[in-house]
């Protein structure tokens, strides 16, 4: 194949791959007709002048995961056809000025996972056709004004995992075609007003895992095409009333892991396309009426691990499409009987790890499609008669770790659990807490003949049983919804070669193994 170096493999498709620790310099001679060259996992430490001079047809060059720490300015001379250049996962601290001169066709430049300390406007001034620039995983502390001014065609810019402490409001001003901007895992404490004003085509903005405390009210007002906004794991304590008002295309918004104390009505919206809203791990204490009413298409709402003690009866107004609601690990003691009434499409609700002492009998009255209910680890002593009778799709109900009072009033619940058991999850069985003579016994195998009579009502009406599937030949499939109920933290949907690591925290949702987060 036109002389393939012994350390490399060359394919008929003009692809050359050179790998191995024995390689300490760019192998020669390289086939003149090579269109793709990969130099991976070698011990090459430097690139000298023009090592690729004779392969001018090259379109893609990947020099990754090497020991590369020094590059001569003329290393890429004569590669006028090159469209893709990756120098990711090396040990570069400095880029020589003019290194990319002459790469007139270059569209993708990957410099991620190096040790770059700074970039200058002159570095990319020749790259007028560049569409993708990956700089994440370096040691950049600031971006000088003008650094990207010549990259007017850029659509994707990743500056994540650096050490940026501030961003100039002018640094992105010429990037009118930018669709993806990632600034995650830096040390940003605030974003100046106007920073994103020029980004009229921006679709994704990743700001998670910084130290942002305040958001300017109009920070996103020019970003009408924004679809994904990641603000999680910052120090945001309040949301200006209008901060999200101009984001009609938004379909993913993450705010978990901040310091939000309250949410004012109308703060979200209108966002007719928002499908998921992640608010866990904040300091929210109450939910007022209509706080989510603009989110007509919302399907996943995660409010777990806050300090919510009060939910107004109309807090969930407008959420007619909601499928998953996570309220676990809060401070709820009581719920209004109408609080879930509008959630006609709700499938999974997690209420575990609260302080619920009782539930209204109509709490799930209009939520006929519920498949999973998590009520474990509350202060429940009994449940109202008939509370689950109409829930024909319920196949996971967790009731353990409550102080069940096993007097004669518990019989309806016990009977309901027994008669419907093949439809429910096989989790830990509820155990009696009182009276003392049955403490520790399983609620469903207590000896009913020694159950203490209830002190308040002599006749215990029971759950109008209607075993969930009356008169059916056998119970339907009992597949657990676990796999859809315990979502992990939302993985920001990145497609870079270097992906973002997101903590897989399965305790967040607490709904079922797939429903954490």
């Amino acid at each position: 194949y036109h002389g393939c170096p012994s350390e490399c493999t060359c394919s008929r498709a003009s692809q050359v791959e050179c790998t191995g620790a024995r390689i300490v310099a760019v192998p020669t001679p390289l086939p003149w007709n090579a269109m793709s060259l990969q130099i991976l996992n070698t011990h090459i430490t430097e690139l000298n002048e023009s090592p690729f001079l004779n392969i001018s047809a090259l379109i893609a060059l990947r020099i990754e995961k090497n020991e590369l720490s020094r590059i001569t300015p003329g290393a890429f001379r004569n590669l006028g056809s090159l469209r893709y250049l990756s120098l990711a996962n090396n040990k570069l601290q400095v880029l020589p000025i003019g290194l990319f001169q002459g790469l007139d066709s270059l569209e993708s430049l990957l410099l991620s996972s190096n040790q770059l300390l700074q970039i200058q406007p002159a570095h990319f001034s020749q790259c007028s056709n560049l569409k993708e620039l990956q700089l994440h995983g370096n040691h950049l502390e600031y971006i000088p004004d003008g650094a990207f001014d010549h990259l007017v065609g850029l659509t994707k810019l990743n500056l994540g995992k650096n050490s940026l402490t501030h961003i100039s409001p002018r640094v992105f001003q010429h990037l009118g075609n930018l669709q993806v901007l990632r600034l995650y895992e830096n040390r940003l404490t605030d974003i100046p007003m106007g920073t994103f004003d020029g980004l009229v085509n921006l679709q994704e903005l990743a700001l998670q895992q910084n130290q942002i405390g305040l958001l300017s009210p109009g920070l996103f007002h020019n970003n009408h095409n924004l679809q994904r906004l990641y603000l999680s794991n910052n120090h945001i304590s309040q949301l200006p009333p209008s901060v999200f008002m101009q984001l009609p295309q938004l379909n993913r918004l993450t705010l978990f892991g901040n310091s939000l104390k309250e949410l004012s009505p109308g703060i979200f919206g209108p966002m007719p396309n928002l499908r998921e809203l992640w608010l866990y791990d904040n300091h929210i204490s109450s939910l007022p009426d209509n706080v989510f009413s603009n989110l007509r298409q919302l399907q996943v709402l995660i409010l777990s691990r806050n300090q919510i003690s009060f939910i107004s009866p109309g807090a969930f107004n407008g959420l007619t499409e909601l499928r998953e609601l996570s309220l676990h690990t809060n401070a709820l003691q009581d719920l209004d009987g109408n609080v879930f009434r509008m959630l006609a499409n709700l499938q999974n609700i997690s209420l575990q790890n609260n302080r619920l002492r009782q539930l209204p009998g109509n709490i799930f009255a209009n939520v006929n499609g519920l498949m999973a209910i998590q009520l474990q680890n509350n202060q429940l002593e009994n449940l109202p008669l008939g509370i689950f009778d109409h829930l024909g799709k319920l196949c996971e109900l967790r009731l353990y770790d409550n102080p069940w009072r096993c007097d004669s009033d518990i019989l309806p619940l016990r009977n309901w659990l027994l008669l419907n058991q093949p439809r429910l999850g096989t989790d830990t069985v509820p155990v009696c807490f009182s009276p003392a003579n049955v403490r520790g016994q399983s609620l469903i195998i207590i000896n009913v003949n020694v159950a203490v009579p209830s002190v308040h009502v002599p006749e215990v009406p029971s759950y109008p049983e209607t075993p969930w599937y009356p008169d059916t030949p056998s119970y339907p499939d009992t597949t657990s919804v676990s796999s859809t109920t315990e979502l992990t933290s939302p993985v920001e949907d990145y497609t870079d070669l270097t992906t973002i690591q997101v903590t897989d925290d399965r305790s967040v949702w607490g709904m079922t193994q797939a429903q954490s987060g």
Epitope: I445, P467, Y475
Partner: antibody, heavy 113, light 111 residues
């Protein structure tokens, strides 16, 4: 004390129906399931159905032939079995609770032409 | 349907000796970590009487010499010291799922 008292023996012709009653006393009627079980002469036990606050569940073998009803005012459960055949000759028992902790004395139903 | 198979069909044991009856289910009768296996005693001309529920829990008024054990598919009823009044037919039953099914019975006699 808990008692389940069943109606007396019946003799029926093939194709006819029979309705057996089970009157409960000594406990809160609405708090417990009532099952029906039958036992053919010299044979084992066969579960037919249960009723709990008007909700019912049937053994497929008896679907369409067995009907359970209850009268809360008299704490009585009824089992009607239709389209009788000779192999339905058996003692029919009612039993209380999910775990069948108390049983009626049984009702002998004889199906004979 | 879950099929319950009892063994032996009949058993003759001397007074004061141990009697053991086995019951095997065609599939597991465990749920919630509980085995939904029950045992009944039936004497001639009488209705059955609940002895053991949920594999190992004694029914009301049942003498301590009756005990149950097992989980999953294999279960045992043990009479630790057979008395004359224990002569009867013993049935196992699963209540994990409808239709609730009984074993064919084991007749216990005195040797």
């Amino acid at each position: 004390q808990v008692q389940l008292v069943q109606s007396g023996a019946e003799v029926k012709k093939p194709g006819a129906s029979v309705k057996v009653s089970c009157k409960a006393s000594g406990y809160t009627f609405t708090s417990f399931v009532i099952h029906w079980v039958r036992q053919a002469p010299g044979q084992g036990l066969e579960w037919i159905s249960y009723i709990y606050n008007d909700g019912t569940k049937y053994n497929e073998r008896f679907r369409g032939r067995a009907t359970l009803t209850s009268d809360k005012s008299t704490s009585t459960v009824y089992m009607e079995l239709s389209s009788l055949r000779s192999e339905d000759t058996a003692v029919y028992y009612c039993a209380r609770d999910y775990y069948f902790d108390y049983w009626g004395q049984g009702t002998l139903v004889t199906v004979s032409s | 349907d879950i099929v319950m198979t009892q063994s032996p069909d009949s058993l003759a044991v001397s007074l004061g000796e141990r009697a053991t009856i086995n019951c095997r289910a065609s599939e597991s009768v465990d749920y919630y970590g509980i085995s939904f296996m029950n045992w009944y005693q039936q004497k001639p001309g009488q209705p059955p009487k609940l002895l053991i529920y949920a594999a190992s829990n004694q029914g009301s008024g049942v003498p301590d010499r009756f005990s149950g054990s097992g989980s999953g598919t294999d279960f045992t009823l043990t009479i630790s010291s057979l008395q004359a009044e224990d002569v009867a037919v013993y049935y196992c039953q699963q209540s994990k799922e409808v239709p609730y099914t009984f074993g064919g019975g084991t007749k216990v006699e005195i040797k």
